[in-house]
């Protein structure tokens, strides 16, 4: 199949990297700068993908594959692909039409994308809140109050840094 | 995962005219060329159509070149084959299929696409 198809179509015999010029007789040329094929037989290359503005290059065009790009420091990628670029906020924010707002008390956001996310509510669970939230961090659960016997703490007290009587070195 | 869907097929009179869409979801569409294939009822698979990734260069099969149109829209992540004046040889199942990152072959053979939809049948009878 290949072969008869090549014997009616010289296009086929031209190769990634280069086009079928139909101006100089379908001999296969180059494709151009800034142009690739990355299969045999185009009849023109396809231009190359460009990283303007917040985009950054990735990965530099080259004759037979598309430049790939990604986003300049200060924003992060959207979209498969890397299609759009969205500014990045500070932990314990998120980004809104008006620009990177806090995150309100009860959500926090530990990383520079995304929403701000409600706290775990500890008792759904049947457990307390050992650690409490804030706009960087969500809390943290322990044990229930009824696994705690009385007076027994919750937290186990750092160990001392040296023991107590002896002068530092 | 990568998934091609198509529709927009159905029964036509010679001379009518359809248009076949191919809804991609699951990777970056934008990024890939696309083309369209046929296989027609006990014949083997035939090239028909294929786009660059932006949309700014095609290329087309004799048979259909002044007939079909294929464009897409990377905003919706849709291939779509606009086909007139359409002829009882048309009668085929289309296929959608996306090309390759790169590929030793040529755009008219199969092994240069490597996910495809499960196709969308077009009937021209009088």
């Known amino acids: 199949f290949e072969r008869t198809r090549s014997l009616q179509d010289p296009c086929s015999n031209c190769p990634a990297g280069t086009f079928c010029d139909n101006n100089r007789n379908q001999i296969c040329s180059p494709c151009p700068p800034n142009s690739f094929s990355s299969a045999g037989g185009q009849r023109t290359c396809d231009i190359c993908r460009q990283c303007k503005g917040v985009f950054r290059t990735r990965k530099e065009c080259s004759s037979t594959s598309n430049a790939e790009c990604d986003c300049t420091p200060g924003f992060h990628c959207l979209g498969a692909g890397c299609s759009m670029c969205e500014q990045d906020c500070k932990q314990g924010q998120e980004l809104t039409k008006k620009g990177c707002k806090d995150c309100c008390f009860g959500t926090f956001n530990d990383q520079k994308r995304g929403i701000c996310r409600p706290w775990t509510n500890c008792s759904l669970d049947g457990k307390s809140v050992l650690v409490n939230g804030t706009k960087e961090r969500d809390v943290v659960c322990g044990p229930s109050p009824a696994d705690l016997s009385p007076g027994a703490s919750s937290v186990t007290p750092p160990a001392p840094a040296r023991e107590p009587g002896h002068s530092p070195q | 995962e990568v998934q091609l869907l198509e529709s927009g097929g159905g029964e036509v009179q010679p001379g009518g005219s359809l248009r076949l869409s191919c809804a991609a979801s699951?990777?970056?569409?934008?990024?890939?060329?696309m083309a369209w294939f046929r296989q027609a009822p006990g014949k083997g698979l035939e090239w028909v159509a294929r786009?660059?990734?932006?949309?700014?260069?095609?290329d087309y099969a004799e048979s259909v070149k002044g007939r079909f149109t294929i464009s897409r829209d990377n905003a919706k992540n849709t291939l779509y084959l606009q086909m007139s004046s359409l002829r009882a040889e048309d009668t085929a199942v289309y296929y959608c299929a996306r090309q390759r990152s790169y590929s030793r072959y040529d755009i008219r053979t199969p092994q240069t696409y490597d996910y495809w939809g499960q196709g969308t049948l077009v009937t021209v009878k009088p």
């Open positions: 699951g990777w970056a569409f934008g990024n890939y060329g």
């Open positions: 786009l660059a990734w932006n949309g700014g260069s095609t």
